[in-house]
Interface confidence: low
């Protein structure tokens, strides 16, 4: 059998095989050693017994999409049946005190490969034997501790394969410079050591994408924005746009990156080299946001020009070049760089919102029959922007971290946006008060630290006589600058 007979029926064209040469990979026309690495079709009953105690699942992931020329990394993780794990020696053991369908196991080992390798082999002193080889016959690399690696992973894509000896998790990186753009399929077959041969335990495949566009994601956040999952923001407050370029292999690390913004509100184009920008919309409505990212990326070097033919007489200087059939972004410059572009578009809605909230006065409420531990306090609050429909008060410890009491209630506020919120405090001490005003689209927060003094009849009486007292009579109030950011994430893959 050949590798392509074993590793799946995705057969790329001859063109694909020729033009997608992966560095360090081999052609799937090579022969597969079926004696050492048996091949089972889907549905073969032997799969059921390929692993003690159930089936092993291989989970294949990649950091796709990859910009052409960058590295794409694939990770395979083996998920063992319940109560099984790989130990430091690469053996598969039962987890202590873990009960599965078969109950607690007396034997600590599912597979004790250390014992097998010690008493097997008849090797020649080098640790090399006829069975320490990959399916194509290449010997295992002898890294330190290689004997503790008991799984053989065969990766297959674009008519080529890559073999790797590993433990229960392996990682393979591939350079995409020669990979055709678009979706491609990666298939992985995993074998486990079995005496002097190997047994297939799992197969998995996933699609990855190679693109000539820079993968761009934008997160949008705004103070007081209530819902982080709609694309609705508030008028007259800056929105922070943060651009994330998906570049896990750091291909663009040394590239100059330009960001060209159009916010759709007739403010013109804004060009920046900073990945973060703030913009404030001053009108309500729906706006089309457009971003173009440009990076000078490493690209293939153009072939050197052929030597000029020996002219019979001196040549005149050349005129302007004709139209280049390549797009502008595709023309490598002398430094072997290509302009790559990424695009992001979103439609965002701008509405009125509560822009700011302030506590302008804090007053102790005189109770004619004061409770032993209870104080009532009135907070006089103003706001700017739209009219709130609810008020929430969270009372917590002085660090503002441990909530002691939270109350939300609907509120009816006039155009002046002036309201009084009355809250009870149990006992003296210092409290953090978070006061939030909200409507359908916005949530505005302010915070204050207050000190509630010890209650005694004299202080209540003195306050009553002084006409209710002001803030400075009975409290120390400290305003905390505290803005809650609700991050708005654009959905991406």
């Amino acid at each position: 059998k050949r590798f392509h007979d074993v590793l799946g029926n995705e057969r790329p064209s001859a063109y694909m095989r020729e033009h997608n040469q992966l560095n360090g990979w081999s052609s799937d026309e090579n022969d597969w050693n079926e004696k050492l690495y048996p091949v089972w079709k889907r549905g073969d009953m032997r799969w059921k017994n390929s692993w003690k105690g159930g089936r092993v699942q291989a989970v294949l992931t990649s950091d796709s999409p990859a910009l052409v020329g960058s590295n794409i990394t694939f990770v395979v993780n083996l998920v063992f049946p319940r109560c099984q794990k790989e130990d430091a020696n690469g053996n598969i053991v039962y987890e202590k005190n873990c009960r599965n369908e078969a109950g607690l196991s007396a034997d600590p080992y599912v597979y004790n490969w250390t014992a097998w390798s010690e008493d097997s082999d008849g090797e020649n002193g080098t640790g090399q034997s006829h069975h320490n080889v990959f399916p194509d016959g290449k010997p295992f690399p002898h890294h330190p501790g290689w004997r503790r690696w008991n799984f053989v992973y065969v990766f297959h894509t674009l008519g080529q394969y890559f073999q790797k000896l590993g433990r229960c998790s392996v990682r393979v990186s591939v350079n995409t410079a020669n990979v055709t753009l678009g979706p491609q399929l990666m298939e992985v077959t995993v074998y486990r050591r079995h005496g002097r041969a190997y047994v297939p335990i799992a197969q998995v495949k996933d699609v990855y994408v190679v693109t000539d566009q820079i993968p761009v994601f934008v997160t949008m956040s705004q103070k007081n924005d209530r819902n982080s999952s709609d694309e609705t923001f508030l008028k007259d407050l800056p929105i922070t746009f943060d651009v994330l370029i998906h570049d896990p292999s750091h291909f663009l690390n040394y590239s100059t990156i330009n960001y060209k913004w159009s916010f759709g509100d007739n403010t013109g184009l804004f060009v920046s080299i900073n990945h973060t920008v703030n913009h404030t919309y001053v009108l309500n409505g729906t706006f089309s946001l457009n971003l173009t990212v440009k990076a000078a990326a490493p690209g293939p070097c153009p072939p050197p020009p052929p030597p000029p033919p020996r002219p019979p007489k001196p040549t005149p200087s050349l005129g302007p070049a004709g139209d280049n059939p390549l797009g502008l972004s595709e023309i490598p410059d002398e430094n072997c760089q290509i302009n790559r572009y990424g695009h992001f578009q979103a439609t965002i809605t701008i509405v009125e919102g509560i822009l700011e909230v302030n506590i302008i006065q804090t007053t102790d409420v005189l109770m004619l029959v004061p409770g032993p531990d209870s104080s009532l306090i009135d907070f006089v609050v103003t706001c700017q922007g739209s009219i709130p429909t609810e008020v929430c008060t969270i009372i917590s410890d002085p660090t503002c971290e441990i909530t002691q009491n939270a109350v939300c209630s609907p509120v009816d506020v006039d155009e002046m946006c002036l309201l009084t919120v009355r809250r009870a405090f149990n006992g003296s001490g210092t409290y953090c008060v978070n006061l939030t005003l909200g409507d359908d689209t916005s949530l505005a927060l302010t915070s204050t630290l207050i000190s509630v003094p010890d209650r005694d009849p004299a202080s209540s009486l003195r306050m009553a006589n002084s006409g209710g007292g002001g803030l400075n009579d009975i409290f120390e109030a400290q305003k905390i600058e505290w803005h809650e950011h609700h991050h708005h994430h654009h959905h991406h893959h």
Partner: antibody, heavy 119, light 111 residues
Framework: QVQLQESGPGLVKPSETLSLTCTVS??????????WSWIRQPPGKGLEWIGY???????TYNPSLKSRVTITRDTSKNQFSLELSSVTAADTAVYYC???????????WGQGTLVTVSS | DIVMTQSPDSLAVSLGERATINCKSS??????????LNWYQQKPGQPPKLLIY???TQGSGVPDRFSGSGSGTDFTLTISSLQAEDVAVYYC?????????FGGGTKVEIK
Amino acid sequence: QVQLQESGPGLVKPSETLSLTCTVSGISITTGNYRWSWIRQPPGKGLEWIGYIYYSGTITYNPSLKSRVTITRDTSKNQFSLELSSVTAADTAVYYCARDLTHWYFDVWGQGTLVTVSS
Amino acid sequence: DIVMTQSPDSLAVSLGERATINCKSSESVDYYGIGFLNWYQQKPGQPPKLLIYAASTQGSGVPDRFSGSGSGTDFTLTISSLQAEDVAVYYCQQSKEVPPTFGGGTKVEIK
């Protein structure tokens, strides 16, 4: 082999809360890159995605149902659950739990459980 | 939300003949050159079963007679030679954006 099994009452009264649990076997619901979804299908109609809980615990709901839906999980039991409040006859459906691998596709489904909303 | 529209609603095809189902999305479901479009088969009393993902990649254990094609907003599921066991309802589904949305389904019967 990964299996999902829905459980819960088959009959719920209008205005009450529908509660279902999906028990997962063969894989931990905290295994990387998987999302665990609820999907429903009214009798004789198409499929509607309700929401999912990611392996990390992040939850996303269908905006059309968001105000009524709660999805939770119990990793010790390898289960995730659905609650749908203030139900009406329009919520009568076969409710499926399903798994999807990152953003690609729903590859494993439960057998489904029919929930009827009726007084 | 992205709206998925399938046509036809139902389809009657002779055994051994080709069946073609179309799916149209209200906006492109392509992302960096790949169509985030899946096809499922559902038989009565059973949950849906994945047939095709990423517009054209066959799911595990799916017979070769099922194939998918298309990009952007227009996608097609083809059954090259209809078998008796293929009688079912077929759904397309986009996975590009949350919420994932399904087409209304196409019922395939034997003529």
